[in-house]
Interface confidence: low
């Protein structure tokens, strides 16, 4: 394992004094209820904290909330509850913070039962001032900001009306009734499902998908018989009832619903589901649930049109009951994803893909670690990491795996070493190369966060007892130092740092409890004096990502190109700084058959990299011929993997087949059609690092 505290470690000198001078305590004059924290804007230092206290009385719930504001990253807070007229704010709606650096905030108030509508408080100056606005409806959901223009808001009412505001919530207009789900699309487009019969719960599968591009002046029904819809990257997905109304199939559009194509995916029955695990403008990871309450399904990866899919991973764990999946995009290295499979023996096992779902392999265990009791062979086993499933099943796992795009190669996760995920107390493991190799960094479960683009990792032990110590590392988790941030331990509730991992401030939240009272308290620690100087050129070293065989000319090639990064040396204790930009040098690789997917009408036989023509088109492929886009029907059987940049090398040029000749009348009758797709096990490669960890794009 990594050197411990007592071994010779590149210690930071005089860190106690430096951190003590930069530790700021704030005690909130508040009854302890719940607390929520939001960052307003990027690099502004503005934090809003909402504390709420509920007193459930016999007839009603009496509530009190307080609003606090900091503009120095949490070192000091000011009570600004009077700006919202001491109103009780509904915590289930949270604080709706505007996109980018708009400085906009919307708080939704609790109103009395008999009122005509709800009430909101709006700020457009980073919460310095608020305007009270009474709504003509009772909101069902949090206000949704248009990604393109933060003045445009969308909300659903408790009566299923769709309401739009064009002046940041000052004036509202109901643009449609009987709306079940609404989402902002691109360029100010609004998509929503509506049921003209009035019910959203009973008639799933009979919904209409509608679109407005002029904020409700006009509408276009872009699809019917809709069960659900989702947006991911450039793709609009609809699951559409088919057959005798018992099956659903995915249809995909890349032009906002003007035209659709059937995705070549298996249809699902009423007890199954589809889920977009990740999507960008180039491709999609789609989970298709297995029939029955199996708890697993199959991951498919799409081509660049979102219509042709290759089988990526079978027995992918995704619970039907709670909807948990361990699928995570490792954002610190292009093309890397981890997830869990449910093995035949019902054990849960971790797998990782370094090539955007082309191949999945077990995680390599740390070199010096011993296999635990789950291992049949004490010498041969792998690392298994805990994610959403472990948390849902109540294991002692306080956090999901963590990675950040600007902390290249760095991954933190709870895990165990064996043949499967263990129910025993997990430890914290760290990878500095995007998941290829791992070290055991900390014993037992911890909360952790990344600061200064990976220059510092901070961790706090997960304990039921009060705590007063944090641990930090300046060398990507190899060596750790401890700092006692308060004499009086606190009951820890959360670790907060500014999103984006560029900050050098960390806030530790918790509460103190004396005989009769409990109070919220926060400690904000600024690490700026630990990293005294700015990093220089000599502090960085060249690192080739995805390197597994330095002798191989194609070493590091993923998705047709390799990337060299400038990375901070582990021995350098310096500031990357807020303006740090990842420096990378890409170089194009030669093409191989692994750079291509099998196109529509083709598949890869087991253990073969060549794409072979399907003997005949099946299922709904005749309508694909007529109502699909024709350019899909002329193919040489191969299609470049989305995002693949390879050039030269293997060029699978062969006779261009015109699949339209198969589009004749000698098809099975509709009654006998089955729509199983013939997934091809194509190799694939990396994404553009745009997914948040554990953010499922769409679950039906």
């Amino acid at each position: 394992s990594a050197p411990g505290e007592d071994e010779e470690c590149g210690r930071v000198r005089d860190f106690v004094a430096k951190l003590a001078n930069n530790t700021h305590q704030h005690v909130f004059d508040d009854l302890r209820g719940s607390v929520s924290l939001s960052w307003v804007g990027d690099s502004t230092g503005v934090i809003l904290v909402l504390t709420t206290f509920h007193v459930p009385l016999v007839i009603m719930t009496f509530g009190q909330s307080k609003l606090y504001r900091s503009e120095d990253y949490g070192k000091n807070f000011k009570d600004i509850t009077d700006l919202i007229n001491n109103t009780f704010i509904r915590t289930e709606f949270g604080m709706a913070i505007g996109p980018e650096n708009s400085g906009k905030v919307v708080l939704t108030a609790e109103v009395s039962g008999g009122s005509r509508g709800g009430r909101i408080f709006r700020s457009s100056d980073f919460a310095k001032n608020f305007v009270q606005t009474d709504l003509p409806f009772h909101p069902l959901t949090q206000m949704m900001y248009s990604p393109q223009n933060s003045d445009y808001l969308l909300a659903l009412s408790t009566e299923n009306g769709l309401w739009v505001s064009k002046n940041f919530g000052g004036k509202w207009e109901e643009i449609h009734k009987t709306v079940c789900l609404a989402k902002w699309g691109r360029k100010g487009t609004i998509f929503f499902t509506a049921n003209h019969n009035g019910s959203c719960s009973n008639d799933r599968g009979m919904l209409e998908l509608e679109r407005t591009t002029d904020y409700g002046k006009s509408f276009k029904t872009v699809a019917s018989k809709i069960y659900s819809f989702g947006l991911g990257g450039k793709f609009l997905f609809a699951s559409v009832m088919t057959g005798k109304g018992t099956l659903r199939a995915i249809h995909v559009s890349v032009d906002d619903g003007d035209t659709w194509n059937m995705a070549q995916l298996p249809p699902v029955g009423h007890e199954q589901f589809y889920s977009i695990l990740a999507a960008n403008d180039e491709m999609v990871f789609m989970h298709v649930d297995e029939p029955g309450d199996s708890g697993f399904g199959t991951i498919y990866v799409s081509d660049d049109r979102g219509t042709v899919y290759s089988k990526s991973l079978e027995r992918h764990l995704y619970t039907t009951t709670g909807g948990e999946t361990d699928f995570i995009n490792v954002t610190s290295l292009r093309g890397v994803f981890t997830t869990s499979i449910l093995a035949e023996d019902k054990s849960v096992q971790s797998v990782i893909s370094f090539d955007q779902g082309g191949e999945w392999v077990p995680l390599r265990k740390p070199a010096d670690s011993k296999c635990d009791a789950t291992a049949r062979d004490p010498e041969k086993c792998s690392l298994h990491i805990h994610a959403a499933y472990s948390i849902a099943t109540g294991l002692n796992v306080p956090m999901l795996p963590l990675s950040e795009p600007n902390a290249v190669g760095l991954v933190l996760a709870h895990g165990s070493v064996g043949d499967a995920i263990s129910v025993m107390r997990p430890d914290v493991y760290v990878s500095d190369d995007g998941g290829y190799t791992w070290i055991k960094a900390l014993e037992g479960p911890h909360y952790y966060t990344i600061l200064d683009s990976g220059g510092i990792i901070v961790a706090i032990e997960h304990s039921s007892r009060p705590i007063n110590v944090i641990k930090f590392s300046t060398d990507e988790g190899q060596c750790w130092q401890t700092y006692t941030f308060t004499r009086d331990p606190i009951y820890f509730t959360g670790l907060a740092s500014e999103p984006g991992a560029r900050s050098m401030n960390i806030s530790i939240w918790g509460f103190t409890e004396s005989f009769l009272t409990s109070q919220w308290v926060s400690y904000t620690i600024d690490f700026k004096d630990i990293l005294e100087r700015n990093c220089e050129e000599k502090d960085y070293t060249i690192w080739l990502a995805h390197s597994t065989d330095p002798e191989d000319y194609e070493d590091g090639c993923i998705l047709g190109y390799k990337e060299q990064f400038l990375r901070l040396r582990k021995s350098s204790v310096c500031q990357n700084g807020r303006d740090y930009v990842v420096t990378k040098q890409p170089s194009i690789c030669l093409c191989s058959l692994e750079d291509f997917l099998c196109d529509f009408g083709y598949y890869r036989p087991e253990n073969d990299s060549k794409c072979v023509e399907q003997p005949e088109l099946k299922g709904h492929d005749l309508e694909f011929c007529l109502y699909g886009r024709e350019e899909h029907l002329t193919t040489n059987g191969y299609r470049k993997i989305p995002g693949d940049k390879c050039q030269g090398g293997v060029n699978p040029v062969r006779e261009v087949k015109d699949l339209k000749k198969k589009c004749t009348s000698n098809f099975l009758s509709p009654e006998k059609q089955n729509s199983k797709s013939n997934g091809s096990a194509g190799g694939s490669g990396g994404l553009n690092d745009i997914f948040e960890a554990q953010k499922i794009e769409w679950h039906e």
Partner: antibody
Framework: EVQLVESGGDLVKPGGSLKLSCAAS????????MSWVRQTPDKRLEWVAI????????HYPDSVKGRFTISRDNAKNTLYLQMSSLKSEDTAMYYC???????????WGQGTSVTVSS | QAVVTQESALTTSPGETVTLTCRSS?????????ANWVQEKPDHLFTGLIG???NRAPGVPARFSGSLIGDKAALTITGAQTEDEAIYFC??????????FGGGTKLTVLG
Amino acid sequence: EVQLVESGGDLVKPGGSLKLSCAASGFTFSSYGMSWVRQTPDKRLEWVAIISSGGSYTHYPDSVKGRFTISRDNAKNTLYLQMSSLKSEDTAMYYCARLCGPLCSGYWGQGTSVTVSS
Amino acid sequence: QAVVTQESALTTSPGETVTLTCRSSTGAVTTSNYANWVQEKPDHLFTGLIGGTNNRAPGVPARFSGSLIGDKAALTITGAQTEDEAIYFCALWYSNHFWVFGGGTKLTVLG
């Protein structure tokens, strides 16, 4: 607003030829399969030809196969029906139509009359 | 060749609900037959009402709805109006015959 406007109908002798046109507007013409449908004097509707979005895939019922040719010019948003070796039973009102598959709705033109008579 | 059968004529009164059906000689109509419903009014005025079993065309009043009832495709007019008096044709898609039309239903709305 979607519009389909047919033209080219006429009185023609048996064995003669005629070319019908259909100008489309108000939707992305190049994205949809299009059909010609006719209504005979006894008011029955009969599908006559279908062409896919890009124009390279066509199909016809046996009654007109080999005599009628459907084509399209996506640049001009126009659908065509070339009819040759016309018979008296081809006398009908001819409609250009967007009949619909799974996820769209149908549109029809106002029709153009073809009479085959000596 | 598949044969598509419709009621030859139906009569209803304003405000009533009326259902027109469309049967296939090959067996049950399914959503894979993508039933289209077309309205013909005097002077050869055809309007596409429903596509793909139940997709109402833009501009078509909400009182028109398409569905499957039993083994048939159906067009239901909820609250018929005098201007709904017309001939209604259904068209079914078959993978071997493509589009086949029914003989049409003449709907009379007694004013």
